[in-house]
Interface confidence: medium
């Protein structure tokens, strides 16, 4: 594993699973507050590859509710507001870290988990396969 | 604080900051392996709102490398392959959870942190402000 120069003020973990199990401070630091970005919340309707948001709930996970983007059309919206099937709406996917209670129902023990979520959709030129 | 029906196998936290500090197992469970999704790795070039990927590295953070999307153009690529400035390329942003070593350089002590990343770009109809 990785060797890290040790800070003398580090907490000492006696856990037999160390370094697999670590202490995590849940007082979440939000690095976004200074930049205060414009939420992308209206893009789902204004995009040429618009999407709907679907709810996925799991009470043993943080965050418990995840909204998944599903592209509305196979094609993309053209200048006339019609669906153009010569282009494709595709989901942009991202892996995110979530926390899962483990063992279940334990208030202070979690496992880090990676899940794939669709964040939104983009319009792409299709890959055309020519048959000989 | 909250009362949770306690699993008899739960680890017991004697930490004075509980429940702000919890144990997290870093042996990451990846929920994506079975689904084997088609990666969106070529979409950044094929999109009508193409983007470049920039590497953001921070050894005090997990994951230490995060790829950030930056839209290539203000407008979108039209059918002729030219940039159409009547449409806008915009980043689709997502908050992700990361772990930050705290205190710095401690191998087994982290704080949960939220950071905003741009995952890709989508093409949207602009909001036109009419001046009276």
């Amino acid at each position: 594993g990785i060797t890290i120069p040790r800070n003398p003020g580090c907490p000492n973990s006696e856990d037999k699973n160390f370094p697999r199990t670590v202490m995590v401070n849940l007082n979440i630091h939000n690095r976004n507050t200074n930049t205060n970005p414009k939420r992308s919340s209206d893009y789902y309707n204004r995009s040429t590859s618009p999407w709907n948001l679907h709810r996925n709930e799991d009470p043993e996970r943080y965050p418990s509710v995840i909204w998944e983007a599903k592209c509305r059309h196979l094609g993309c919206i053209n200048a006339d507001g019609n669906v153009d099937y010569h282009m494709n709406s595709v989901p942009i996917q991202q892996e995110i870290l979530v926390l899962r209670r483990e063992p279940p129902h334990c208030p202070n023990s979690f496992r880090l988990e990676k899940i794939l979520v669709s964040v939104g959709c983009t319009c792409v030129t299709p890959i055309v396969h020519h048959v000989a | 604080g909250i009362t949770i029906p306690r699993n008899p196998g739960c680890p017991n936290s004697e930490d004075k900051n509980f429940p702000r500090t919890v144990m997290v197992n870093l042996n990451i469970h990846n929920r994506n392996t079975n689904t084997n999704p088609k990666r969106s790795s070529d979409y950044y070039n094929r999109s009508t709102s193409p983007w470049n990927l920039h590497r953001n590295e921070d050894p005090e953070r997990y994951p230490s490398v995060i790829w950030e999307a930056k839209c290539r153009h203000l407008g979108c690529i039209n059918a002729d392959g030219n940039v159409d400035y009547h449409m806008n390329s915009v980043p689709i942003q997502q908050e992700i959870l990361v772990l930050r070593r705290e205190p710095p350089h401690c191998p087994n002590s982290f704080r949960l942190e939220k950071i905003l990343v741009s995952v890709g770009c989508t093409c949207v109809t602009p909001i036109v402000h009419h001046v009276a």
Partner: antibody, heavy 126, light 107 residues
């Protein structure tokens, strides 16, 4: 559809404490937080504090720090708000409100109050 | 704390008229602004979340716009049942804060 049902009206004397309950039904209790908001007669809404069920973390408005305690019991899906050192200024309707714990449209945690209890009237009078 | 200032404080409107209520934040709050309707002796009800997102079950005549510091709630074609007090609420920074409210009544 989540429903929040609060305990009944209370009449208290100055210096006493009041504890109000908020029973949730319909939906997973751990999938949201509960905030407490009060409204003095003829006045606007004032946030007192809230609890994030998933981690059991509480946050309080500075004005109420040290006087308010918010707790929750997952086994009964009930949240509680206790306010001590009551004065006549604490006469108000107290509401519990659901705060979803969502990863919504690419963002962790939503903070709108999408469901409210019916309110509990607390009267403080000597 | 972030201060939200609503205007006007009071509005008397004829049915079918368009109503516009504004909410100004003392600092940039992105789109972390929500609108509620409260009728006499009732609990508040969520109308719009995140500045412009409509809520299932809320009539389409209610809409929201704005970002940063300036936000607007619009009622397109007021109906008698819309007589209520309307509050804006910011969730960008703790503590959550509310505007002072705008009372809308029917002429």
């Amino acid at each position: 559809e989540v429903q929040l049902v609060q305990s009944g009206a209370e009449v208290k004397k100055p210096g006493e404490s009041v504890k109000i309950s908020c029973k949730a039904s319909g939906g997973s209790f751990r999938s949201y937080g509960i905030s407490w908001v009060r409204q003095a007669p003829g006045q606007g809404l004032e946030w007192m504090g809230g609890i994030t069920h998933f981690f059991g973390i509480t946050d309080y408005a500075q004005k109420f720090q040290g006087r308010v305690t918010i707790t929750a019991d997952e086994s009964t899906t009930t949240a509680y708000m206790e306010l001590s050192g009551l004065t006549s200024d604490d006469t108000a309707v107290y509401y519990c409100a659901r705060e979803p714990n969502d990863f919504w449209n690419g963002y962790y945690d939503t903070h709108d109050f999408d469901s409210w209890g019916q309110g509990t009237t607390v009267t403080v009078s000597s | 704390e972030i201060v939200l200032t609503q205007s006007p404080d009071f509005q008397s409107v004829t049915p079918k008229e368009k109503v516009t209520i504004t909410c100004r934040a003392s600092q940039n709050i992105g789109s972390e602004l929500h609108w509620y309707q409260q009728k006499p002796d009732q609990s508040p009800k969520l109308l719009i979340k995140y500045a412009s997102h409509s809520i299932s079950g809320v009539p389409s005549r209610f809409s929201g716009s704005g970002s940063g510091t300036d936000f607007t709630l619009t009622i397109n074609g007021l109906e008698a049942e819309d007589a209520a007090t309307y509050y804006c609420h910011q969730s960008d920074t703790l503590p959550h804060t509310f505007g002072q409210g705008t009372k809308v009544d029917i002429k």
